[in-house]
């Protein structure tokens, strides 16, 4: 999906008012210096691409974040403020089997959510030069 046509200001507002708090809740009890940010993004569409990937694609050691509140709010924000996003997702996953995942918070998931926090912060500051 090409995130170029999203309403970035509305997504930013959703992040600031809701998603950011849910990410903090998920990370509660974890030191902010515990994980190094290794994932970066260069502009807002790129940031949303990376955010979508880290939020919804299973990775080794972190099978699923999709049942977390921040993930659901991310998905809804993309559906509402990115034209055609939900149709793209429906078509892309039509052949895959629906399955319910157990919510398990692993250290790998915590690291992944820490990366997400960094991506969202970058999304909110699009004019900053890439480090």
């Amino acid at each position: 999906y090409d995130f170029t046509n999203c309403d970035f200001e509305k997504i930013k507002a959703a992040y600031l008012s809701t998603i950011s708090k849910d990410l903090i809740t998920y990370m509660s009890g974890t030191k902010s210096t515990e994980f190094n940010n290794t994932v970066s993004c260069s502009n807002r569409p790129h940031c949303l691409t990376e955010i979508q990937s880290l939020t919804f694609n299973p990775t080794a050691g972190c099978a699923s974040l999709a049942k977390e509140m921040f993930a659901m709010k991310t998905k809804a924000a993309l559906a509402i403020w990115c034209p055609g996003y939900s149709e793209t997702q429906i078509n892309a996953t039509q052949a895959m089997k629906k399955r319910r995942k157990r919510k398990v918070t692993t250290n790998k998931c915590l690291e992944q959510v820490s990366q997400l926090q960094g991506l969202w912060r970058r999304f909110n500051r699009p004019l900053l030069k890439q480090q």
Partner: nanobody
């Protein structure tokens, strides 16, 4: 599998109001459930448009086109979501669908949704 049934659609004059309901069966939502319930609409020949979402913690999102006119709410005890639609305009005419997301991984339908209810705004 969650089944969703919408009701409350109909013909209304511009400036009027309607309240849509969406009853979910096949799943009981408790105070600890994590889910999204939302509404999207589709007018003939037009792309689907998401209008609103409510989350199990009470947070809500609205599309610009309906903000200030539509209000989404949910009653966990009745497994029902509502969309109160005020100051309706002819451009609000569409089939309205209720949808639910329970955070499935690789969700085959992205969201589960109902059959829809037709809202017609015309004088």
């Amino acid at each position: 599998e969650v089944q969703l049934v919408e009701s409350g659609g109909g013909l209304v004059q511009p400036g009027g109001s309607l309240r849509l309901s969406c009853a979910a069966s096949g799943r009981t939502f408790s105070a600890h459930s994590v889910y999204t319930m939302g509404w999207f609409r589709q007018a003939p020949g037009k792309e689907r448009e998401w209008v609103s979402a409510i989350f199990s913690d009470g947070d809500t999102y609205y599309a610009d086109s309906v903000k200030g006119r539509f209000t989404i709410s949910a009653d966990n005890s009745k497994n029902t979501a509502y969309l109160q639609m005020n100051s309706l305009k002819p451009e609000d005419t569409a089939v309205y669908y209720c949808a639910i997301d329970e955070g499935m991984d690789y969700d085959g339908n992205f969201y589960d949704w109902g059959q829809g209810t037709l809202v017609t705004v015309s004088s």
